[in-house]
Interface confidence: low
């Protein structure tokens, strides 16, 4: 993500349809587009381009080397070489990348998704538990705010696209295979009923599985590595 | 055990649009990652329509993607194939499965198409 | 015309071993995995080997799965009159980003 900041049509971690909606701001024009981080690749990015009244999006992995490509075209040393190549040469995409849709004035690229996530889950939390609305709901909010932080982080990877919950192994191997082999693909399961999960990736069209362990102060760790409190944070870094 | 069951119209006139349903039994549509859709013509081999994600996402065949919808409805636990402008060559017997390798398929179900 | 290549028809008698080939390419089963499914006379097909070589739980032992660069092969021994059947194998392929299938293989058991 560093490499991209500086970029005035970085949107950060904004979903798909976020993207779409800035390029209808931007009037939808042919070959307008917009950068924003990858959901789906560790590294990666999503370039989304409008062409015929519609968006169209592209993944740009992150190679081992540092470099960056769309998937089977040609690689490039940051994402910004990438857009610049490809405002000259279409090389797979379905135009050329005409014009940057800037942020908004005030606008900073999104950090993750992880904190507006976490807003509408204790919103949903406190609404479904105390059945409440209006400003009795905001209050609450507020009110139980830290406490609830905790309880949501715990469980925001259930919202996540790339939690696949009680999936076999052989399911988590069949789900990454599918579609683009690209490296850092990658998707996180539960693996049994003690709160440890299982990191299946893809590196090089192999898949290797990775043991995500809980510890007795119930951290997080592939065997050897940093702990972690929440998947989430796992995954982030 | 997972159990899968194809309906709809055993005859499609032509130029119309198929619609089959698969219900879903003994299996949380939303727990498994693939649902798929599959025909055999009368005395042929097997061809795969296009598969769904529980959570909505789809990939459909090449050849038949102009023509393909599947759509998931996890509240009735069911998934749903149409298929639309047919032709006498889409009269086959239509399988659902689950999983990306087809782990558990339904019976199937005979869909004829003629006017 | 099947992308995946079987031989129409093969034939054994009871308590032979057969073997039924599935020939493709380096963008189907040169870089996937292979699924095997056997077809009983107006029936659905059922998954008799993933993963390449995996038996699901209930197919006898009887059946197995291998792969060697772009082909895969079923063998099945011991043969009994109730394998008479179809059999389809099947993979991914990168290229087309969609499975395909064989053309399916018929086997008589003899006698």
């Known amino acids: 993500v560093d490499s991209a900041n500086h970029l005035t049509y970085f949107f950060g971690n904004i979903t798909r349809e976020e993207a779409e909606d800035y390029l209808v701001q931007g009037g939808m024009t042919d070959g307008l587009y917009l950068l924003r981080q990858s959901r789906n690749y560790l590294g990666g990015f999503a370039l989304s381009v409008a062409h015929n009244r519609k968006a169209h999006h592209y993944t740009i992995e992150r190679e081992l080397n540092g470099t960056y490509a769309i998937s089977g075209g040609r690689a490039h040393a940051s994402p910004a070489d990438l857009c610049h190549y490809h405002s000259q040469e279409p090389d797979g995409l379905i135009c050329l990348l005409k014009k940057p849709f800037n942020r908004p004035p005030g606008v900073q690229p999104k950090t993750g998704p992880f904190e507006d996530l976490k807003e509408n889950l204790i919103r949903e939390y406190v609404k479904q538990t105390w059945n409440l609305q209006g400003q009795a709901l905001e209050q609450a909010i507020i009110s139980q705010k830290p406490q609830l932080e905790k309880l949501i982080a715990t469980t925001a990877h259930e919202k996540m696209p790339w939690f696949h919950g009680n999936i076999s192994r052989d399911e988590s191997e069949q789900t990454v295979l599918i579609g683009s082999k690209t490296n850092g693909k990658f998707l996180i399961r539960a693996r049994d009923n003690s709160g440890s999960y299982a990191l299946c990736l893809l590196h090089e069209g192999k898949v290797l599985h990775y043991r995500i362990d809980r510890d007795k102060t119930g951290k997080l760790s592939i065997p050897e590595g940093k702990k972690f409190d929440t998947l989430w944070q796992l995954v982030e870094h | 055990q997972v159990q899968l069951q194809e309906s709809g119209p055993g005859l499609v006139k032509p130029s119309d649009t198929l619609s089959l349903t698969c219900a879903v039994s003994g299996y949380s549509i939303s727990s498994s990652n693939w649902w798929g859709w599959i025909r055999q013509p009368p005395g042929k081999g097997l061809e795969w329509i296009g598969y769904i994600y529980h959570s909505g996402s789809t990939y459909y065949n090449p050849s038949l993607k102009s023509r393909v919808t599947i759509s998931v409805d996890k509240s009735k636990n069911q998934f749903s194939l149409k298929l639309s402008s047919v032709t006498a060559a889409d009269t086959a017997v239509y399988y659902c499965?689950?999983?990306?390798?087809?782990?558990?398929w339904g019976q199937g179900t005979l869909v004829t198409v003629s006017s | 015309q099947s992308v995946l290549t079987q031989p129409p028809s093969a034939s054994g008698t009871p308590g032979q071993r057969v073997t039924i080939s599935c020939s493709g390419s380096?963008?189907?089963?040169?870089?996937?995995?292979v699924y095997w499914y056997q077809q009983l006379p107006g029936t659905a097909p059922k998954l008799l080997i993933y993963?390449?070589?995996q038996r699901p739980s209930g197919v006898p032992d009887r059946f197995s799965g291998s792969k060697s660069g772009t082909s895969a092969s079923l063998a099945i021994s011991g043969l009994r009159s109730e394998d008479e059947a179809d059999y389809y194998c099947?993979?991914?392929?990168?290229?087309?980003?969609?499975?395909?299938f064989g053309g399916g293989t018929k086997l008589t058991v003899l006698g």
């Open positions: 993963r390449n070589n």
């Open positions: 499965a689950r999983n990306v390798g087809f782990h558990d």
């Open positions: 099947a993979a991914w392929d990168d290229s087309l980003a969609s499975p395909v």
């Open positions: 380096s963008s189907n089963i040169g870089s996937n995995y």
